[in-house]
């Protein structure tokens, strides 16, 4: 139903990384515009992206208010130039999104190795604690602030001269690993939330190798 030249949105999809959250949908509009509404299960609907010709809407500002809540969005379709026009049932066409719980579903962004420091046969590798758009007391929280011990990091490391990888894991953002004296090593890290059922792992960080400027070597 609805006016003859209006079609309902479809393929509503949440795209979210480190809580930066965008709702996408189809189709590209022809003679129509969209408005998005978002709500928690128990809350009121809030309108965003009014009368847009885009097929995406950034809902980050809404979901970061409480990342542990479950959200539902819907996309309304209106005839272009006649947004007061409604479907035959007396209201505009709309389509519901799947439910979305940011804490459980946002993708973990690619981590970055902040630094590594060798002291004798030990290397301390530090992972950058990436800032998110989640706020508390007017400050932006880091990934670790949000996820606490639900978030772990896995370090893959290997001698530059070989391909055999070793693994270390941490509940903090730091690793302290044993290495062979006089050998250069390469490192890559991955963020993991073991308790999740979906989107448990990030992509691997860019590889960083000893002998490059990011690290520091100290002979003790």
């Amino acid at each position: 139903s609805g006016t003859t030249n209006t079609v309902a949105a479809y393929n509503l999809t949440w795209k979210s990384t480190n809580f930066k959250t965008i709702l996408e949908w189809e189709p590209k509009p022809v003679n129509q515009v969209y408005t998005v509404q978002i709500s928690t299960k128990s809350g009121d609907w809030k309108s965003k992206c009014f009368y847009t010709t885009d097929t995406e809407c950034d809902l980050t500002d809404e979901i970061v208010k409480d990342v542990k809540q479950t959200y539902l969005a819907r996309v309304f379709s209106y005839p272009a130039g006649n947004v007061e026009s409604t479907g035959s049932a007396g209201e505009p066409l709309y389509e519901n999104s799947p439910e979305f719980t940011p804490y459980l579903e946002t993708n973990l962004g690619q981590p970055t190795i902040q630094s590594f420091e060798q002291v004798g046969t030990k290397v301390n590798v530090t992972v950058e604690d990436e800032r998110t758009l989640v706020r508390r007391n007017n400050t932006f929280l880091s990934l670790r602030d949000v996820f606490g011990k639900d978030l772990i990091y896995t370090l893959y490391y290997w001698k530059s001269s070989s391909s055999g990888k070793k693994t270390a894991k941490t509940n903090t953002n730091e690793f302290l690993i044993d290495v062979d004296k006089g050998e250069n090593y390469c490192f890559s890290v991955q963020a993991v939330i073991p308790s999740r059922t979906v989107n448990r792992k990030s992509t691997d960080s860019p590889v960083e190798c000893m002998g490059q400027e990011k690290g520091e070597f100290r002979e003790i």
Epitope: S142, T170, S195
Partner: antibody, heavy 118, light 106 residues
């Protein structure tokens, strides 16, 4: 509901070893790292180490390396801590515990009281 | 390792009084967590990540701080608050606890 069951007490002789158990139920055992904490009588808390039950990866407090060995049995959802070469300094209550940030909850066993005495 | 020093070691408070327990870290930590332990029982999480109330904890408890100085405040002490209180950091290995503050009710 979540339960972490630990035996109430163990009496062991100096120089011997003891293997403490922490049987879990009510949650997915492999989803959360298990931690062990020591508390001597009338004293504070000391972190011993942690284990990832999914693959038995461990991190230890350097102070307890060689003293404590953490293991798990996934089939019975049980975590273990073996304490070796026991002395009177090892007489304490030992807790197993894990934390779930999503629920802002932590869960603790009741603790096992280990007494080292001849 | 990061050493956490709590003060006072023992505190006596009257019912309804507001009290503050402090925890000083030997080097900067990202956040502090607070535990309550009543006699003969396991510790219980009160505050996580410096200022967040753990599940089921009464709102009279609050936490604040940053860097090397953190505090736990009870806005109106009740009889059931008699316990040992520990600060705890898991920012860096090995994780450490403060020596504890024993709260007694007058």
């Amino acid at each position: 509901q979540v339960q972490l069951q630990q035996p109430g007490a163990e009496l062991v002789k100096p120089g011997a070893s003891v293997k403490l158990s922490c049987k879990t139920s009510g949650y997915t055992f492999t989803s959360y790292w298990m931690h062990w904490v020591k508390q001597r009588p009338g004293q504070g808390l000391e972190w011993i180490g942690e284990i990832d039950p999914s693959d038995s990866y461990t991190n230890y407090n350097q102070k307890f390396k060689g003293k404590a060995t953490l293991t798990v049995d996934k089939s019975s959802s049980t975590a273990y801590m073996q304490l070796s070469s026991l002395t009177s300094e090892d007489s304490a209550v030992y807790y197993c515990t894990y934390y779930v940030n999503y629920y802002a909850m932590d869960y603790w066993g009741q603790g096992t009281s280990v007494t080292v005495s001849s | 390792q990061i050493v956490l020093t709590q003060s006072p070691a023992i505190m006596s408070a009257s019912l309804g009084e507001e009290i503050t327990l402090t925890c000083s870290a030997s080097s900067s930590v990202s956040y502090m967590h607070w535990y309550q332990q009543k006699s003969g029982t396991s510790p219980k999480l009160l505050i996580y990540s410096t200022s967040n109330l753990a599940s089921g904890v009464p709102s009279r408890f609050s936490g604040s701080g940053s860097g090397t100085f953190y505090s736990l405040t009870i806005s109106s002490v009740e009889a059931e608050d008699a316990a040992d209180y520990y600060c705890h950091q898991w920012s860096s290995y090995p994780y450490t606890f403060g020596g504890g503050t024993k709260l007694e009710i007058k």
